[in-house]
């Protein structure tokens, strides 16, 4: 049956046993800045092009054992959530991956900046259709990272990022705090904010909306047909990147402001239990869970 | 995220150094009275001291960025410091990434075209 997360973002009219928008996102290219990925996984084979971009720090620890499957874990799962054949949101979207996170999931602001610059240069050299950039990472507040995101957004690129998994104000983290970026928090099957041990999804006024981010089934790098469940605001951001790809594929001329407005408009309202958030953050945190547009756009989204 | 709201630095550390220009025997001194600022991550464990993003003013050309980077290297060498330019930015933001001692920050902040300098820091998969 359909995974809970795909059911949650699907308009009621399309909730059959399968989630199947066959051509979702086909006009859009989604850039993923993350770990390395297993591009020959059945979920994403032929859908993800691995660029030659790599800018990562050395792994911590003297006895670190590098295993390809572990190095690829995070990125492979997210690529699957965005465009996977069976468990993806925008099954028609093509993706390009840049490696900015090492085998331990760690990167640098500078490496991310160089990655964003690489995307901008690629866009200038070979202009294509709409671009979505998925940044499933977070660090402390960074003026320069936010500035780079702002410049890329002003060049017409849609940036989607994870709010962060620190159970904290997203405004203290980057790129989550960049105003031009679509910042996504995570909710679970009960529409509760996701708890990750003592930590959990970030919140506050720098979050634009929430999306499914707990127990998300997606491609596992353990084998080319394996699946695994992962949780986090990265998974939530991947859902919104997929939804954005589908919206932009249906309406390629959408501006960032219009896309943001549509994401908010079609979101489920006031379903999140706000008691989970600190009292002073409840009024600032948007009570919105991302969803695809309903049947009024049937011809556009489900061709 | 969340457009239409004022930007907030939170605990973000900003060390503002208002510095007069020091010509150091080279042309292109900064305009009188300009202030370049230094920024670093508020979370100490995520800081990566020794690597800095030098961000130049918006309309700075690539050739000026390269010249500013070379100038920093020359001035640092005169003081006995080794520096390494790791990347020159253009296309999104003008500037360069430099590996150098934190002792050189005051010098770097006085360079022409410099808007601000940010110490590198870690980001993590979420």
């Amino acid at each position: 049956s359909i995974p809970w997360n795909l059911e949650r973002i699907t308009p009621p009219r399309y909730r059959a046993d399968e989630y199947q928008p066959p051509d979702g996102g086909s006009l859009v290219e989604v850039y993923l800045l993350d770990t390395s990925i297993q591009s020959d996984h059945r979920e994403i084979e032929g859908r993800v092009m691995v660029t030659d971009f790599e800018n990562v720090p050395e792994e911590d620890g003297t006895r670190f054992h590098r295993q390809a499957s572990k190095c690829d874990s995070h990125g492979t799962h997210l690529a699957g959530v965005v465009s996977g054949r069976d468990a993806g949101v925008a099954k028609g979207a093509s993706m390009r991956s840049l490696r900015v996170l090492n085998c331990q999931g760690k990167g640098t602001v500078s490496g991310t900046l160089i990655g964003l610059e690489f995307i901008r240069k690629s866009q200038l050299v070979q202009p294509v259709g709409p671009l979505v950039v998925l940044l499933p990472l977070a660090g402390g507040y960074s003026r320069v990272l936010n500035a780079a995101c702002q410049r890329l957004a002003r060049a017409g690129v849609v940036l989607v990022t994870a709010a962060g998994n620190f159970r904290d104000d997203a405004c203290l983290y980057s790129p989550a705090s960049a105003p031009e970026v679509i910042t996504v928090g995570a909710t679970n099957a009960q529409d509760q904010p996701v708890t990750l041990g003592t930590l959990g999804t970030n919140f506050g006024r720098c979050v634009d909306l929430f999306a499914p981010g707990e127990d998300i089934i997606g491609a596992s790098s353990d084998c080319s047909t394996c699946f695994v469940s992962q949780s986090g605001t990265s998974q939530a951001a991947a859902h919104v990147a997929g939804i954005a790809a589908m919206m932009l594929s249906a309406e390629p001329e959408l501006t960032l402001a219009e896309l943001r407005q549509r994401l908010i408009h079609f979101s489920a309202k006031d379903v999140i239990n706000e008691a989970w958030f600190p009292e002073d953050q409840r009024v600032l945190t948007p009570n919105l869970v991302a969803a695809l547009p309903p049947s009024t756009h049937e011809n556009l989204y489900f061709q | 995220g969340a457009m239409g709201q004022e930007d907030e630095d939170g605990d973000y550390e900003e060390l503002v150094l208002a510095l007069r220009s020091e010509e150091d025997g080279l042309a292109e001194a900064p305009e009188h009275g300009t202030t370049a600022t230094f920024h670093r991550c508020a979370k100490d464990p995520w800081r990566l001291p020794g690597t800095y993003v030098v961000v130049l003013k918006e309309e700075t050309h690539l050739s000026q960025s390269e010249r500013t980077a070379r100038r920093l290297q020359a001035q640092a060498a005169r003081r006995g410091y080794l520096t390494k330019i790791l990347h020159v930015f253009h296309g999104l933001l003008p500037g360069f990434l430099v590996k150098m001692s934190g002792d050189l920050l005051e010098l770097a902040l006085k360079l022409p075209h410099v808007d601000y300098i940010e110490e590198d820091s870690s980001v993590f998969a979420q």
Epitope: E59, D60, G61, T62, R63, F64, H65, R66, Q67, K70, S73, C103, Q104, G105, K106, N165, F166, L196, G197, T198, L199, S231 | K43, D44, P45, R47, F124, A125
Partner: antibody
């Protein structure tokens, strides 16, 4: 609910070996780093070892390096501590504890077991 | 011997405030996140504070944490008899590549 239960403690002679286990339940074990911490009778807490969520990295206190091995089986939701060449000074209550998160292992420990007692005596 | 130093004991009357210091160096407190743990007599330790000043859910706001340079401080206001326990600071030490605990402080409610 979230729970850690240690087992395998007991009385052992110096120079011998012992293997401690820690059974985790109520959370996604494979998403968290795990620590062993010990406390000698009447003394303070002493960190022993840490293993990353996927087992790819291990760290040890100098006092146990080369003698103790931390490992985990994510399919069984179990953490282990293999203790070889035991000494009298290894006598303590051994706690397993969950790291606050996988990537931010230096954040500390948020869930603790009740401990298992190891006595090294001839 | 612990690389983080705490006072052996502090005491105050019910309702009063106590502070516990934890002194380290740049390789631990200076550049790493500090946590505080409470150990009630005969029980396992419990996390009180992480990331210098954040409280896990369920920990009352009577407990607070702060950091300055290479020292950290735990504050307990409105002291209650149930707060009688041993308190430990803890942090990662980058030069040791390991976690370190403070020497521990016993809090007595007079």
């Amino acid at each position: 609910q979230v729970q850690l239960v240690e087992s395998g403690g007991g009385v052992v002679q110096p120079g011998r070996s012992l293997r401690l286990s820690c059974a985790a339940s109520g959370f996604t074990f494979s998403s968290f780093g795990m620590h062993w911490v010990r406390q000698a009778p009447g003394k303070g807490l002493e960190w022993v070892a840490l293993i990353w969520n996927d087992g790819s990295n291990k760290y040890y206190a100098d006092s146990v390096k080369g003698r103790f091995t931390i490992s985990r089986d994510n399919s069984k939701n179990t953490l282990y501590l293999q203790m070889n060449s035991l000494r009298a000074e290894d006598t303590a209550v051994y706690y397993c504890a969950r790291a606050i998160a996988a990537l931010y292992y230096y954040y500390g420990m948020d869930v603790w077991g009740q401990g298992t007692t190891v006595t090294v005596s001839s | 011997q612990s690389v983080l130093t705490q006072p052996p004991s502090v005491s105050a009357a019910p309702g009063q405030k106590v502070t516990i210091s934890c002194s380290g160096s740049s390789s631990n407190i200076g550049n790493n996140f500090v946590s505080w743990y409470q150990q009630l007599p005969g029980t396992a330790p419990k996390l009180l504070i992480y990331d210098y000043n954040k409280r896990p859910s369920g920990i009352p706001d009577r407990f607070s944490g702060s950091k300055s340079g290479t020292s950290a401080t735990l504050g307990i206001t409105g002291l209650q008899t149930g707060d009688e326990a041993d308190y430990y600071c803890g942090t990662w030490d980058s030069s040791l590549s390991g976690y370190v605990f403070g020497t521990g402080t016993r809090v007595t409610v007079l």
